[in-house]
């Protein structure tokens, strides 16, 4: 099931998903001046068997100007290039997502893709805050935001960050560690089924993560 | 639950132009790619474009392009396909469909629509 | 890109096996299909080549790969009296729709 949302927006923070589960969508977008090709692939899906997840379809932008000039590349994911995902820019791979079952790594970079990619996320879904440059965190609880399915609906959980204005010399001076509940709030629904899948693994992996796997600059 | 209703038959005279509507409810709209898919009396389904009514983003088969225009309008959660110079090959049932990223899960009931003079 | 089927119409009894096949014009890392039934919408039946949407029975079967692809019926009963059609997700394109009938 897609959720019907976009993750939460926390002011001074930007959140990146580890890894999207099987099902998760991006759109196909193509920076100014730049179309999809003819025909071309409207989003990329990932999906795979048991053993292993890919991303299906492929992005290719061509300039709205010419007819014929197809523009594409496909690199490794060690030739990744920076670029904003969603609202937070992944130059690099924290852990090996391609050993997470049922979910795909970052989709590498296609030429003149669009500024910011425009992912359709699925329950069960966990993605990861941090401050902006400039500004450090307070947590009070897990900084991480999960897609569940409550009575039929979907909603994402409330990350427990805040993010103030302090300048540091470090980005995050004395911050404790995640905790490992997925939960960032309590919830007064408990008499009905909450729809989630792989919270323990994606939080034993959130554990493991280092801060300096988001890089602070944005466009 | 999810459901797409499409405007009632059309008969068109050649050259016209014809719209048909695609009211979505029980799904959040703006979230899903929304397809529009032909079929001619006894033939094969034939997709014809898409919009993504999020940022109102189209795509279009070669085929059609330069005569189907596709549109949404989030606010009544509705799509639009208009298929202009209409001719006699257009005579089919066109139906719009959701786009659950592996396959179209739900489907309008279908429009016929008659190109005859 | 073009899919192209085989049989076009296909009689066959109940209990029977059956194979339909799609052969894309391009290689494709994925096939969907569809069944329809007269005067009816569609309706996704297999979908990443041997994946069964919600509510088909399980003598339906997807496989293949590359440009060559099947789907099977294991014992054919009435109610899978359809036509079928594979779908290539990439280029949205169909194939000409497999006819099955029931002597």
């Known amino acids: 099931e897609l959720c019907d949302d976009d993750p939460p927006e926390i002011p001074h923070a930007t959140f990146k998903a580890m890894a999207y589960k099987e099902g998760t969508m991006l759109n196909c977008e193509c920076k100014r001046g730049f179309r999809r090709i003819k025909s071309g692939s409207l989003y990329m899906l990932c999906t795979g068997n048991s053993s292993h997840s890919s991303w299906d379809n492929q992005c290719q932008c061509t300039s709205s100007a010419t007819r014929n000039t197809t523009k594409q590349v496909t690199p490794q994911p060690e030739e990744q290039k920076e670029r904003k995902t969603t609202e937070m820019q992944s130059p690099m791979q924290p852990v090996d997502q391609a050993s997470l079952p049922g979910h795909c790594r970052e989709p590498p970079p296609w030429e003149n893709e669009a500024t910011e990619r425009i992912y359709h996320f699925v329950v069960g879904q966990m993605v990861y805050y941090q401050c902006v440059q400039g500004y450090r965190a307070l947590h009070r609880g897990p900084a991480e935001s999960v897609c569940k399915m409550t009575h039929g609906k979907t909603r994402w959980t409330q990350p427990q960050l805040i993010c103030t204005g302090e300048m540091e010399t470090s980005q995050f001076p004395g911050e404790e560690k995640p905790q490992a509940s997925p939960e960032g709030r309590p919830e007064s629904e408990t008499s009905c089924l909450v729809t989630t899948t792989d919270f323990q693994i994606q939080t034993e992996m959130a554990a493991t993560m280092e801060t300096s796997i988001f890089t602070t600059e944005y466009q | 639950q999810v459901q797409l209703v499409q405007s009632g038959a059309e008969v068109k005279k050649p050259g016209a132009s014809v719209k048909v509507s695609c009211k979505a409810s029980g799904y959040s709209f703006t979230r899903y790619w929304m397809h529009w898919v032909r079929q001619p009396p006894g033939q094969r389904l034939e997709w014809m474009g898409a919009i993504y009514p999020g940022n109102s983003d189209t795509s279009y088969s070669q085929k059609f392009e330069g005569r189907v225009t596709i549109t949404a309008d989030t606010s009544a959660s509705t799509a639009y396909m208009e298929l202009s110079s209409l001719r006699s090959e257009d005579t089919a049932v066109y139906y719009c469909?959701?786009?659950?990223?592996?396959?179209?899960?739900?489907w309008g009931q279908g429009t016929t629509v008659t190109v005859s003079s | 890109i073009v899919s192209t089927q085989s049989p076009d119409t296909q009689s066959v009894t109940p209990k029977e096996k059956v194979t339909i096949t799609c052969r894309a014009s391009?290689?494709?890392?994925?096939m969907q299909w569809y069944q329809q039934k007269p005067d009816q919408s569609p309706k996704r039946w297999i979908y990443?080549?041997?994946k069964s949407a919600s509510g088909v029975p399980s003598r339906f079967s997807g496989s293949g790969s590359g440009t060559d692809y099947t789907l099977t019926i294991n014992s054919l009963e009435a109610e899978d009296a359809a036509t079928y059609y594979c779908h290539q997700r990439s280029s949205y394109t169909f194939g000409q729709g497999t006819k099955l009938e029931i002597k």
């Open positions: 990443d080549t041997s």
């Open positions: 469909s959701r786009d659950y990223g592996y396959y179209f899960d739900f």
């Open positions: 391009s290689s494709r890392s994925y």
